[in-house]
Structures are given as structure tokens and as C-alpha cells.
């Protein structure tokens, strides 16, 4: 059974993940991003279901494509450092989903833009955090 300290740790990790995802979204989803139009042409796989921490497997599998798209945004105005950011996210995701059980991710039929993809995982984090608090 989860202890209060493990719940608190999970909550903090989710908040960190949420902040990272929001910062990425904030960095790209605005009119000042010169590469936004191009970035929106890339397609991401969305989870069929995302209600538990194990479903973060679906996010983990899309981190490499995410990094590649974020590399497009590099300019004097964008300080995302995709490699560092994705590496941080990867570490958090691995800790949160655990490595004991192997979960096969199921994807929805429809693909999504980077903005829809990030918003979906932001909503996931907010939803899990709200159940923990």
C-alpha cells in the first residue's frame, strides 16, 4: 500500500513533469515561434487510455519524436534545450511508471499535433495530481 511519503513523492514528480510539459507548450504554442506552422505538421500518437501512472509508457515512447520536433524551435528566442528537457522528462516518467511491470501501450487511431499531444499529457498530470491531493 502506498505510504503518505511515497504519495507525496509521486505528487512532486507529477508536478515537475506537469511544469516541464507546460513550459514546452508555452515555448512553442505562441505567435512568436517562427517554426510553429512547420511544427504543427508533425503527428504524434495519443494514448487510447490514460488514467493511471502505467499509461505514461505511451508518453515515454513519444519522447524521441518530441525531441526531434523541439529541435526545430531552437532560436535566440527559444531556450528549450530539448536534449536536457527530454532527458529530465524521461527520468521522471521512468520513476513514475515503474519498471517492474511491462505495459504495452495502446494508441488511439487518430494522430495529433504537438499542441494536442502536450495538452493531453498536461491534462493527464493534472488529473492524477487532483486524485492525490
Amino acid at each position: 500500500a502506498p505510504t503518505s511519503s511515497s504519495t507525496k513523492k509521486t505528487q512532486l514528480q507529477l508536478e515537475h513533469l506537469l511544469l516541464d510539459l507546460q513550459m514546452i507548450l508555452n515555448g512553442i504554442n505562441n505567435y512568436k515561434n517562427p517554426k510553429l506552422t512547420r511544427m504543427l505538421t508533425f503527428k504524434f500518437y495519443m494514448p487510447k487510455k490514460a488514467t493511471e501512472l502505467k499509461h505514461l509508457q505511451c508518453l515515454e515512447e513519444e519522447l524521441k519524436p518530441l525531441e526531434e520536433v523541439l529541435n526545430l524551435a531552437q532560436s535566440k528566442n527559444f531556450h528549450l534545450r530539448p536534449r536536457d528537457l527530454i532527458s529530465n522528462i524521461n527520468v521522471i516518467v521512468l520513476e513514475l511508471k515503474g519498471s517492474e511491470t511491462t505495459f504495452m501501450c495502446e494508441y488511439a487511431d487518430e494522430t495529433a499535433t504537438i499542441v494536442e499531444f502536450l495538452n493531453r499529457w498536461i491534462t493527464f498530470c493534472q488529473s492524477i495530481i487532483s486524485t492525490l491531493t
Partner: antibody, heavy 126, light 111 residues
Framework: QVQLVESGGGVVQPGRSLRLSCAAS????????MHWVRQAPGKGLEWVAV????????YYADSVKGRFTISRDNSKNTLYLQMNSLRAEDTAVYYC???????????????????WGQGTLVTVSS | DIVMTQTPLSSPVTLGQPASISCRSS???????????LSWLQQRPGQPPRLLIY???NRFSGVPDRFSGSGAGTDFTLKISRVEAEDVGVYYC????????FGGGTKVEIK
Amino acid sequence: QVQLVESGGGVVQPGRSLRLSCAASGFTFSSYAMHWVRQAPGKGLEWVAVIWYDGINKYYADSVKGRFTISRDNSKNTLYLQMNSLRAEDTAVYYCARGSYYDSSGYYFGEDFDYWGQGTLVTVSS
Amino acid sequence: DIVMTQTPLSSPVTLGQPASISCRSSHNLLHSDGNTYLSWLQQRPGQPPRLLIYEISNRFSGVPDRFSGSGAGTDFTLKISRVEAEDVGVYYCMQVTQFPTFGGGTKVEIK
């Protein structure tokens, strides 16, 4: 001093078109992004569209996408909003507002929405 | 879209007394460039909006120092230290971290 003057508003029937203009003076128009914002009678503010300093990138609110077109003529220091397929819910005062400043290498800085025009009223009614 | 929620809807204040308006964002507004693009606008009756505060707490040129902004992340506040007659109007928070969105507005009126 910075001045933005909108024109082109009026009464128009649903389904018809209208073109708004915003004449800018007192600053280097070609170095700034520009926005259109609207305000329905007695309501709050709603962002409509933005255009980059060079006119290359344009973005729209979902409510006007596919119907409205933002453009600019830097030689005339003028911003435009072409409004097609107008609906009753487009009735509002339309404001132009100045966006971020871009330097010669495309680096942006400065405040968005720092100067606004007086607005022009568009009424869509049969 | 980022949703901006303002409270209160209306704020009746006595001349010379302080006033405070809150604004909450549905998303953290910290941009990857390190700035938080949260602004406050004032709209006097029959007038266009006017920029008061940008990037949470920076007063725009010509704005009296009785206006101040504070906050971080998702929660922001505009304070008027001593309300004057010319401060009557509607105040809007807005974010330009992503595509611009505005709060619903707070009407400041004299009691």
C-alpha cells in the same frame, strides 16, 4: 507619439463582407507584429488575429478561422482585416493593437498590446 | 486555450482606499525564455483598453505607481494602493505566453 486609427466599420447583413483598416503612425510599423482584438457590446475582450512584422506568419482565433484574413502593407503603414461570411456574433468594436518589436535578426522583445486604437464598430444585422 | 479567471466580478471601493483584483490561469504561464507574459489592462468607460502592467509586475510608461502587479505561475494580483476617481472602469488580466486570452474583467466602481 504612437497612433493607431481604425476605419471601415459599419452595418452589414449576415453572410456579407467588410474590410477594416488600421492606420499606424509614430513608430516603425514594419518592425512590429500587429493584432486585432474585438469587444462585443457590453462584453469582454476577445483576441481575433495577429500578423508578424513582415507579414509572413498569421494566426487566428478559432471563432474566425477560415472567414477572416489579416494582412498588412508596410509601405502604407496600414493593417487590414478582411471579414467574410459575417455572422451576428461578429458584432463588436474592433481594435487594432501593437505587438512585439522585432530587430533585424528576427529577435523579438517589448510588450504586446502596449498601444491600442480607438476602435471601429461592426454591426452584423439583417 | 488558456483560460483566465478573474475575481471579483465587481469591486465597489471608497476613494483613497486600496483595491485588489485576482487572476488565475488554467496553465502555468512561465515561458521557456524565463518570462511570464501576464499583463493587466484598464478600460475606462467609453475608452479603448490601455496597458497598465506587463510581465506580472512591470508598470508601463506613464502608469501611476499606485498600480502594482504581483504573482507567479498561475496566480496573479493587481493592486491599487489608493483608488482615485479616474481609476473607475473595467480591469482585465491577459496572457500572451501562448496565444492571447483575456480574463472576463473586473469592474471597479466608487461606493
